[in-house]
């Protein structure tokens, strides 16, 4: 079932404790063993699991993908999902842990040649609704990367977002992908809109700094829905 | 911050059906994944459904797979649960909760870290 599967998968949370406002401090008080965090509502047990729905991996955390939890799932069935570790299987870099990549089909750590000289690199994008298959057209293209401990620069080639140093993200640029700027208050950004809609980008754009997020350009609101700007706006 | 309030509840026979709203305000409501969770007396609190903050993606327990229906509206910040088909089971307090974004805030596991103060759903036989 479901449950089953996700049960391993999700960080697990408990309501505020009784009298406690939403997103107001309360008084700490745990029905489970697990993290409580200072003020507000935000408690962190094991009681039972969450899946968290998402549609891209941006969606999850950095230690997670976003993908059906079942094997030839319900595509309309997609959650934040444990990262894969070394040797295990993939079939994209996003499902392997910071630090690996997806190569041949199974997460290998990018420092196997130490993060010196040349490498070739295998970077598949697909472009098929459901973003966690192979399914539907993929382009495969050779890259020839330097990668060193330092974190990538603008422009630099990258596997996710870790890759990149602070303030950069790792999004598709062509048929590759390369560290971007974080995108800055003002700035356009992109709502996906259609579930899968982000993989038919050749020029993604970052996400939204830290306090911003992507919403309708409050002068576009009566434009129609195609023609919306969004753009990066505070909380 | 953001506040969610829960409303809908209320008694139902068995049978019969409810429509859960849950309102958001504070921060930007369309960012989070949204879900909705429930406890019985003397039970521990389990999930029930999530949509994803596109509405692109939806889950289910399966004790309500088919009878119950997630929905949201971003442009009132509200999210919906539909409960056909109410069972004496399904009597609890439901808990509506939002999620963080994952790694667009910087965290390794997406996670709920919002919650409501619910509302109280009772199905009698």
């Known amino acids: 079932t479901l449950n089953s599967v996700l049960n391993s998968n999700a960080i697990k949370n408990l309501p505020p404790p009784l009298g406690g406002a939403a997103g107001h401090p309360g008084s700490a008080v745990s029905a489970a063993p697990g993290i409580l965090y200072p003020g507000g509502n935000k408690y962190q047990t094991i009681d039972n699991y969450q899946p968290y729905p998402c549609a891209e991996d941006e969606e999850c955390g950095t230690d997670e993908y976003c993908a059906s939890p079942t094997r030839g799932g319900d595509a309309g069935v997609q959650i934040c999902l444990a990262c894969r570790k070394r040797r295990k299987r993939c079939m994209r870099h996003a499902m392997c842990c910071p630090g690996n990549y997806c190569k041949n089909g199974i997460c290998v750590s990018s420092d196997q040649n130490h993060f010196r000289g040349e490498i070739e690199e295998t970077i598949t994008e697909s472009f098929g609704n459901d973003h966690s298959t192979l399914d539907g057209y993929s382009r495969r293209t050779t890259l020839s990367s330097k990668m060193y401990h330092t974190k990538g620069q603008e422009g630099s080639v990258c596997l996710r977002s870790s890759d990149c140093a602070s303030g950069l993200c790792c999004a598709r640029h062509f048929w590759s992908k390369i560290c971007k700027p974080v995108l800055k208050e003002g700035q356009v950004c992109t709502k996906h809109r259609r579930k899968g809609s982000h993989g038919l980008e050749i020029f993604q754009r970052c996400y939204c700094g830290e306090g911003l997020s992507c919403r309708i350009q409050k002068d576009h609101h009566q434009a129609s829905n195609s023609s919306r700007l969004h753009t990066c706006q505070r909380h | 911050e953001v506040q969610l309030v829960e409303s809908g509840g209320g008694l139902v026979q068995a049978g019969g059906s409810l429509r859960l709203s849950c309102a958001a305000s504070?921060?930007?409501?369309?960012?989070?994944?949204m879900g909705w969770f429930r406890q019985a007396p003397g039970k521990e609190r389990e999930f029930v459904a999530a949509?994803?903050?596109?509405?692109?993606?939806?889950v289910y327990a399966d004790s309500v797979k088919g009878r119950f229906t997630i929905s949201r509206d971003n442009a009132k910040n509200t999210v919906y649960l539909q409960m056909n088909s109410l069972k004496p089971e399904d009597t609890a307090v439901y808990y509506c909760?939002?999620?963080?974004?994952?790694?667009?805030?910087?965290?390794?596991?997406?996670?709920?870290?919002?919650w409501g103060q619910g509302t109280q759903v009772t199905v009698s036989s």
């Open positions: 909760a939002a999620g963080n974004g994952g790694r667009t805030y910087g965290h390794s596991r997406a996670r709920y870290d919002y």
């Open positions: 949509i994803s903050w596109s509405g692109g993606s939806t």
């Open positions: 504070g921060r930007t409501f369309s960012s989070y994944a």
